[in-house]
């Protein structure tokens, strides 16, 4: 039995619902009483949801899953996963058994956008050209881990003296703190870009130092 799932990962935002598509081709005269459908976590083989003996056997996965009962007879074995969490990320196997059997696995990629970065400066007063300052760029509650880029006002990448740390909170979302140590010129703009590699979403923050005063756009 050929069971089909998407090749590309299903991308779902944290807190939204995701559909893991799975389909099979029922033969003429197929009845739901013949269908045995099982969704499982691929890696641990934990049961997620099942359908057997003509009945939806329900969710075995935190009561956040559902089938599409009206579409099963047409060969649609897709699974709805509600209120997606970071911990849901991974591969799900769809196993279909009628007279024949088959299975296929589909990957769920969880994502969350990063907040607009906040910029802080240390020290933040009485700055002169030649002073060394520490600029911190902070962005919150994103997933997966971010890529962080710094550049000056002319768009030249700043790669030296950058330290980036990413810490996951209890929901698995990351807070990013990136620190740039730089020697001040006469004036200058320093920009931080926090990129979510899955969503291809960029969050920008910048600080402009003009002797006195400083501005934080």
């Amino acid at each position: 039995l050929e069971v089909q799932v998407p090749e590309d990962p299903v991308v779902a935002l944290v807190g939204t619902d995701a559909t893991l598509c799975c389909s099979f081709s029922p033969e003429p005269g197929f009845s739901l009483a013949q269908l045995n459908l099982i969704w499982q976590l691929t890696d641990t083989k934990q049961l997620v949801h099942s359908f057997a003996e003509g009945q939806d056997q329900g969710s075995a996965y935190a009561n956040r899953t559902a089938l599409f009962p009206d579409l099963l007879a047409q060969g649609n074995a897709s699974l709805r996963l509600q209120r997606v969490r970071v911990a849901d990320e991974g591969s799900f196997t769809c196993f279909v058994s009628i007279r024949d059997f088959g299975s296929a696995a589909v990957s769920l990629q969880v994502a969350a956008p990063y907040s607009k970065p906040s910029m802080t400066l240390e020290p933040n007063k009485d700055l002169r050209p030649g002073d060394t300052v520490t600029i911190t760029c902070s962005s919150y509650r994103g997933y997966p881990e971010a890529e962080v880029f710094w550049q000056d006002g002319q768009g030249v990448p700043l790669t030296g003296n950058v330290t980036t740390s990413q810490m996951a909170n209890e929901q698995g979302l990351f807070d990013v703190h990136s620190v740039l140590r730089v020697v001040l010129g006469a004036n200058g703009t320093y920009s931080c870009l926090v990129r979510n590699p899955v969503l291809q979403q960029d969050a920008h923050g910048s600080v402009t130092i003009t002797g006195q005063p400083m501005t934080f756009p």
Partner: antibody, heavy 117, light 109 residues
Framework: EVQLLESGGGLVQPGGSLRLSCAAS????????MSWVRQAPGKGLEWVAY????????YYADSVKGRFTISRDNSKNTLYLQMNSLRAEDTAVYYC??????????WGQGTTVTVSS | QSVLTQPPSASGTPGQRVTISCSAT????????VSWYQQLPGTAPKLLIF??QRPSGVPDRFSGSKSGTSASLAISGLQSEDEADYYC???????????FGGGTKLTVL
């Protein structure tokens, strides 16, 4: 066509190391769990190690625990088995296997490992 | 000692029906998840049966069944090309490991 192609087998002395590779094609490698299964000359099949789709879940047979390490590179569609502290009883044909649900649906052709002085 | 027990050998003449058993020796083995593999001489094993069902491409001469703590593989209309080693296997949830039976060498007389 779904294919698994093992490489890296050979002759190695007791106590030595070897790394087996398995190149996968024809399926979405990153979504599937994989295993290594071996067969000593004239003997039956013995499961060696298992790895989940992302590489975060691994299980080993007691006979190889602490000596063998299974890993994968999903960007290269490749499965690995690092074998250290090899013994004569590790001599076998090693098969790379694709798993699906509760069965092993695709097997490689195998690569031979001989441990001898 | 394997937790899945198979007879080491079996034989039959062409056209005959042969059955190979696979018995679970511990209670936590799920006989509903037993798979069977055929290994022809000098080749890699191939999936033959899962939970009494054949995957596409396997001749209907091969069938699987289960009863109590045993699973069985039956081959009807035996042919010379069926001469091979046959293995049963299952995943042991409690040990997180695959378990293979010792294998049965089938000879076509």
């Amino acid at each position: 066509e779904v294919q698994l192609l093992e490489s890296g087998g050979g002759l190695v002395q007791p106590g030595g190391s070897l790394r087996l590779s398995c190149a996968a094609s024809g399926f979405t490698f990153r979504s599937y769990a994989m295993s290594w299964v071996r067969q000593a000359p004239g003997k039956g099949l013995e499961w060696v190690a298992y790895i989940g789709s992302s590489g975060g879940t691994t299980y080993y047979a007691d006979s190889v625990k602490g000596r063998f390490t299974i890993s994968r590179d999903n960007s290269k569609n490749t499965l690995y088995l690092q074998m250290n502290s090899l013994r004569a009883e590790d001599t076998a044909v090693y098969y790379c296997v694709k798993e699906s649900y509760y069965y092993m649906d695709v097997w490689g052709q195998g690569t031979t490992v001989t441990v001898s002085s | 000692q394997s937790v899945l027990t198979q007879p080491p050998s079996a034989s039959g003449t062409p056209g005959q029906r042969v059955t190979i058993s696979c018995s679970a020796t511990i209670s936590n083995i799920d006989i509903n998840r037993v798979s069977w593999y055929q290994q022809l001489p000098g080749t890699a094993p191939k999936l033959l049966i899962f939970n009494s069902q054949r995957p596409s491409g396997v001749p209907d001469r091969f069938s699987g069944s289960k009863s109590g703590t045993s699973a069985s593989l039956a081959i009807s209309g035996l042919q010379s090309e069926d001469e091979a080693d046959y293995y049963c296997a299952t995943w042991d949830d409690s040990l997180n490991s695959w378990v293979f039976g010792g294998g049965t060498k089938l000879t076509v007389l």
